[in-house]
């Protein structure tokens, strides 16, 4: 009988140890959850505040209305310029209006002076039509002033306050454009 009681007591003690372990695990898990919750809240808070403080354009880009512009500091041929813009999630500049043209030429004067800058304009080899990179036609006031005599592909560039044309394989600076981030506050 005594042996039976002692066995039951040992079993109960074993159960108690297991429960204590489970409780300890639970407490540890709860503490870990609380820590994770704190971390998540802090992370969300940081994300929200950084989103709140973030500017509509990346560093070294210029904003005008809904667009951000990047004026390159390197020369490249037209096709490589396009690639360089794509790397940044942008395309070569597409000038939609005289107001945008004025802003660009005004900004260039302040930044660098009178250099050549590739834009996203090229001339179709067959039809001779000028088209922006998305396939749209430039407005009549925004056609390159001089027709290039090049037998090769011809692309558009900005110089001073004019839109001009040149062999796409010549080296120039370039301007990229992307949409400005809309502020939600």
């Amino acid at each position: 009988k005594l042996l039976q009681v002692s066995t039951i007591a040992m079993q109960q003690q074993e159960k108690l140890i297991q429960q204590e372990r489970a409780l300890l695990n639970f407490t540890e898990w709860k503490r870990s959850c609380a820590l994770q919750m704190k971390y998540c809240q802090a992370f969300m808070q940081n994300s929200l505040s950084s989103a709140h403080n973030s500017s509509p354009c990346p560093n070294n880009w210029i904003q005008n209305r809904e667009s951000c512009y990047y004026v390159s500091e390197i020369w490249s041929i037209w096709h490589t310029s396009q690639e360089n813009c794509l790397k940044e999630g942008s395309t070569l500049l597409q000038i939609e209006s005289k107001e945008e043209m004025d802003f660009i030429t005004g900004s260039l004067r302040k930044i660098k002076g009178s250099y050549d800058y590739w834009v996203g304009l090229s001339q179709d080899g067959h039809s001779g039509r000028w088209l922006w990179q998305d396939g749209s036609s430039p407005s009549p006031g925004l056609l390159p002033a001089e027709r290039s005599q090049s037998a090769n592909q011809v692309c558009g560039y900005v110089k001073s306050n004019s839109l001009l044309s040149s062999n796409c394989s010549t080296w120039k600076y370039f301007i990229c454009e992307k949409y400005a981030l809309r502020s939600s506050v």
Epitope: E83, L86, K87, E88, G89, S90, T91, Q133, D134, G135, E177, K178, Y179
Partner: nanobody, 115 residues
Framework: QVQLQESGGGLVQAGGSLRLSCAAS????????MGWYRQAPEKQRELVAA???????TYEDSVKGRFTISRDGAQNTVYLQMDSLKPEDTAVYYC?????????WGKGTQVTVSS
């Protein structure tokens, strides 16, 4: 790392249409733009069309008005709808993804346009 898988190539008659797909996997959050290149035999690889994550597009002159690039952000997939195909569109079409640091290429899909 970004992995790209193209599909949709094939043989089509001149004037016909094809739709190419390129599915990206891996570090897709780092992609800034995706696009299509093509390479015909004995020719250099050329950019056909590209689209940025903002939806800005760029096309090679000879495909403007015939090809349309689009994307499905949720599926991390880019499509190239090719209409009014010409024999000179015959090439291997490669998908490319641009990140700020690196460029990634797919293995390519063959498009053949017969006259």
């Amino acid at each position: 790392q970004v992995q790209l898988q193209e599909s949709g190539g094939g043989l089509v008659q001149a004037g016909g249409s094809l739709r190419l797909s390129c599915a990206a996997s891996g570090s897709v959050f780092s992609i800034n733009a995706m696009g299509w290149y093509r390479q015909a035999p004995e020719k250099q690889r050329e950019l056909v069309a590209a689209i940025t994550t903002q939806g800005r597009t760029t096309y090679e002159d000879s495909v403007k008005g015939r090809f349309t690039i689009s994307r499905d952000g949720a599926q991390n997939t880019v499509y190239l709808q090719m209409d009014s195909l010409k024999p000179e569109d015959t090439a291997v079409y490669y998908c490319k993804a641009w990140t700020a640091k690196d460029d990634y290429w797919g293995k390519g899909t063959q498009v053949t346009v017969s006259s």
